[in-house]
Amino acid sequence: SNQPPGGGGGSGGDCPGGKGKSINCSELNVRESDVRVCDESSCKYGGVCKEDGDGLKCACQFQCHTNYIPVCGSNGDTYQNECFLRRAACKHQKEITVIARGPCYSDNGSGSGEGEEEGSGAEVHRKHSKCGPCKYKAECDEDAENVGCVCNIDCSGYSFNPVCASDGSSYNNPCFVREASCIKQEQIDIRHLGHCTDTDDTSLLGKKDDGLQYRPDVKDASDQREDVYIGNHMPCPENLNGYCIHGKCEFIYSTQKASCRCESGYTGQHCEKTDFSILYVVPSRQKLTHV
């Protein structure tokens, strides 16, 4: 087998509820309405529901290891390791995938990790001056006649590695996505590797919130003690390709077996069944009521 038969640092447990209660749920969230929808589509990416006053909130309970094994996320951010990336996806309720091992680009100041352990967790690089805020690695050129944000991102040394971005355009390398983001002063994310195709609906690609500006340094390296991550899985061996029809195959360390993490709307051992059930939860002071 390609998978080691032992070793994670996660611990098991049910979805923890507040006030000493335990809610039997896996991926539930809060909607701002009287009837709160709690289903896979409302609290994804490893979130679990927790009672919060009269309602429920989507909690991201991750306790990440702090080994510095940087990965580049599809949002252009570098994360200290895959766990931090997943935690960020959960916190922001946005899909973030690993597009490359290693930092997103070499000039971000977070370094190779040679002799280093922790990510810097630095804030957004912005230059405030008479230019106004320059975002996405842009710098203010105060000497220029038209005074504006100047982009000094050099993508000349990058090899051909086409990606499809959130603006619906194909770029020859992730570096050019950052360059475009810098020039346009707007968030452009990498949607997937490879050129955009006809099936890539630009309305679905979407843009990131302006409140989540591009950060060039290692992300989400915050205090670990706030959450508990229930994790005991790793990628499945290559011979299990196709094991999960509509989902992700995971190798469970403790049981030494493969299992499927199904996409929203699918269920079954191999994510082969369509799941039409949606759980609605009406918050009340006494209990959680299934409608």
Partner: antibody, heavy 121, light 107 residues
Framework: QVQLVESGGGVVQPGRSLRLSCAAS????????MHWVRQAPGKGLEWVAV????????FYIDSVKGRFIISRDNSKNTLYLQMNSLRAEDTAVYYC??????????????WGQGTLVTVSS | DIQMTQSPSSLSASVGDRVTITCRAS??????LAWYQQKPGKVPKLLIY???TLQSGVPSRFSGSGSGTDFTLTISSLQPEDVATYYC?????????FGQGTKLEIK
Amino acid sequence: QVQLVESGGGVVQPGRSLRLSCAASGFTFTSYGMHWVRQAPGKGLEWVAVVWYEGNSKFYIDSVKGRFIISRDNSKNTLYLQMNSLRAEDTAVYYCARAYCGDDCYPFDYWGQGTLVTVSS
Amino acid sequence: DIQMTQSPSSLSASVGDRVTITCRASQGISNYLAWYQQKPGKVPKLLIYAASTLQSGVPSRFSGSGSGTDFTLTISSLQPEDVATYYCQKYNSAPWTFGQGTKLEIK
């Protein structure tokens, strides 16, 4: 099956260099961080260094920083430890070991048989 | 760096005895702790990971417990083949430090 085979050990004088290799087989090499662990004669285990995945993240124990260089050649499924400015206290059996760290982290499930490095004048 | 301290450094027990080895981390490491067994002249073998999860193929008489800074390896009924040196190791972040080891002998 998974195999890790170290080589390159031997007797070397203080101040000289030695390069250890660890040939890996039976698993997807790029899916694992590769480590060196050493054990001085009659002593306990001492973790030495790690190189993760593509080789862009490395870490060393303080006593070897600046003298040892860990690296990997993923095309050859081989891990290396370049040991420079060797000292008598570097005398030990050197083991390579694999570990998976991604979303979660796991310790050493497979070890090599070890190669003995003796630093002596 | 976080230090790992094992106790005792050596112990002698009889076959059938319940044996306990402790490991203390100088700072909290959650449950990123492993226990290894090394028999004389052999390569270390993983026994326990995630502080309390038994490695595949390891006899059930071995168990682990603890979280944060204090951890325990227990052998419920000592067998002759358990004669070895036992090491704890943290792996939440580099350096992946080992404890100094506990040498277990049969009386």
